[in-house]
């Protein structure tokens, strides 16, 4: 019968010739009467056989990735009579693994989107990084992730690749974020290969700023002719936030007189100071007013950040009108 | 803090007129909504404004006394001042410039006041 | 123009007691548009109290402001040695107009 033991060969070997063991006959007594011979996919260009021992060589480099295993044939023939010893044989040559691949994150690019003042723990996104290495080979596809950028707002589980929130961040300080993240190989032991990715992290607006006045006084004249319902002039407050977060409602907060109100223009987010009763400059010709601000949508879980509406006093002359 | 200053003549003549000066410390004239007033005493008495102007020279002066009064600013120099013609010695008091208030028309800061004599 | 009556033109009080000063207007104001200044001898008038409740800046709260309609009171809780000068109402809604003032005096 045949005789054999499991045959490997490591990939990527320089050598011109590598012997990768012996396939024999235990009829063969060493005199040289046998010849071997290989056939299949390989053989005699990658693989090649000693005829009279049977020693069995490779004579290429090899890369696994590339082809993991040659399933080859093997005769055996008595050279005096041209006859077969044994009957044909298959075997296997598996090609064992080197660490040559660095690992490599094969979604990029990364980008997520997360809440502004989101807390410590909450999850970003997560990132996987693939090694061409044979994962049942040691640790050659063994991955930890690492954070090279982004402290302290940011950390990475170092065997799963989940980005989380560490730190509050405020989108009105910064809106967005570089993270870079690397992957190695070998579980981060000396010869590991690495590789690394970018995450772009964008904060969402949440309504953590209450509208403010840009003037804390502002001064309007209005003519004693002006009819009900004239628009005097205008006042603004601002918000740091953005879209629906940054929409408001002003109204009027003192006005003993009650000849004044204010509605809100939702396309420029100013308020407009109307006249509601017609002024008589001989009765009144100095008003006050305080008005205040306040957004249109808070959530509950933000009223915090809206305790006390912003105001502003508005000073109103009225302007004298000749009467016939 | 805001510091109002009055300067000028202490003794003008019946018929003249009357020039004082005020200026502006520790804050802007230009400051939106606040006016600039005059308020004068006469001696021994009680208080009688005189006008206001805004720091786009917007002025509104005191009816009894509208004919004979002009302020103007100046707001490169921070300063306003009170032009008052035609005066007797009726016109002799303390003057005073002051500034209105954030919250209303009341007088928030004051100066110390000059008195202004009118006599030959 | 609004006329300010002060009432009454002396008060004559001891150290420790209370003051209740009255400020009357010739027809009606808003009570946002009135203030209390008091004036020592020789110096500029100095904001008390405006809108008509609001101590302004720095007052001690002994200095307390009402009233509404044409009817306005300053009183003083306890009277310190330095309160002792004279007291003066003004209206801003219809022009500015000052009362002749009251005149507390030791008793």
């Known amino acids: 019968g045949w005789v054999w033991n499991q045959f490997f060969v490591p990939e990527e070997m320089n050598t011109t010739s590598h012997h990768i063991g012996q396939l024999r006959s235990d009829l063969d007594n060493g005199n040289n009467s046998f010849q071997y011979k290989l056939l299949g996919a390989g053989a005699g260009s990658t693989f090649i056989i000693d005829e009279r021992t049977g020693d069995i060589y490779a004579i290429q480099k090899l890369d696994r990735e590339e082809r993991s295993l040659y399933i080859l044939r093997a005769q055996v023939i008595d050279i005096a009579t041209g006859r077969a010893v044994e009957p044909e044989s298959e075997f296997v040559i598996k090609v064992s693994d080197i660490n040559d691949n660095e690992p490599k994150f094969l979604d990029e690019p990364y980008e997520a989107i997360v809440p502004e003042m989101s807390p410590e723990g909450t999850l970003v996104i997560q990132v996987t990084a693939s090694d061409a290495d044979d994962p049942s080979s040691g640790n050659n596809a063994r991955l930890l992730y690492s954070l090279l950028q982004g402290q302290p707002y940011f950390s990475v589980e170092p065997t799963t690749g989940v980005i989380r929130i560490s730190s509050k961040m405020d989108r009105e300080l910064q809106d967005e974020y570089w993270v870079i993240i690397q992957a190695k190989d070998m579980i981060g032991q000396p010869g590991a290969l690495s590789g690394t990715t970018s995450v772009l992290i964008k904060l969402s607006d949440v309504n953590d700023n209450k509208p403010i006045f840009k003037e804390s006084l502002y001064r309007l004249t209005v003519s004693e002719s002006a009819p009900t319902g004239t628009s005097i002039g205008t006042i603004m407050a601002y918000d740091n936030d953005i879209g629906e977060n940054a929409e408001m409602d002003y109204s009027i907060e003192e006005d003993d007189s009650q000849t004044f109100d204010i509605i809100t223009n939702h396309e420029t987010q100013e308020g407009i100071v109307i006249l509601k009763k017609k002024v008589d400059f001989e009765h009144q010709n100095h008003y006050g007013i305080r008005a205040k601000v306040k957004n249109h949508h808070v959530p509950e879980q933000l009223m915090k950040y809206h305790t006390e509406a912003s105001t502003t006093f508005i000073k109103i002359q009225v302007e004298d009108v000749d009467e016939p | 803090q805001v510091q109002l200053q009055e300067s000028g003549p202490g003794l003008v003549k019946p018929s003249q007129t009357l020039s004082l000066t005020c200026t502006v410390s520790g804050g802007s004239i230009s400051s939106s909504g606040y006016y600039w007033s005059w308020i004068r005493q006469h001696p021994g008495k009680g208080l009688e404004w005189i006008g206001y102007?805004?720091?786009?020279?917007?002025?509104y002066y005191n009816p009894s006394l509208k004919s004979r009064v002009t302020i103007s600013v100046d707001t490169s120099k921070n300063q306003f001042s009170l032009k008052l013609s035609s005066v007797t010695a009726a016109d002799t008091a303390v003057y005073y410039c002051?500034?209105?208030?954030?919250?209303?028309?009341?007088?928030?800061?004051w100066g110390q006041g000059t008195l202004v004599t009118v006599s030959s | 123009e609004i006329v300010l009556t002060q009432s009454p033109g002396t008060l004559s009080l001891s150290p420790g007691e209370r003051a209740t000063l009255s400020c009357r207007a010739s027809r009606q104001i808003s009570s946002s548009y009135l203030a209390w200044y008091q004036q020592k001898p020789g110096q500029a008038p100095r904001l008390l109290i405006y809108g008509p409740s609001s101590r302004a800046t720095g007052i001690p709260d002994r200095f307390s402001g009402s009233g509404s309609g044409t009817d306005f009171t300053l009183t003083i809780s306890r009277l310190e040695p330095e309160d002792f000068t004279v007291y003066y109402c003004q209206q801003y809604g219809s022009s500015f107009t000052f009362g002749p003032g009251t005149k507390v005096d030791i008793k």
């Open positions: 102007i805004y720091y786009t020279g917007s002025a």
């Open positions: 002051a500034r209105d208030g954030s919250s209303g028309w009341y007088f928030q800061y």
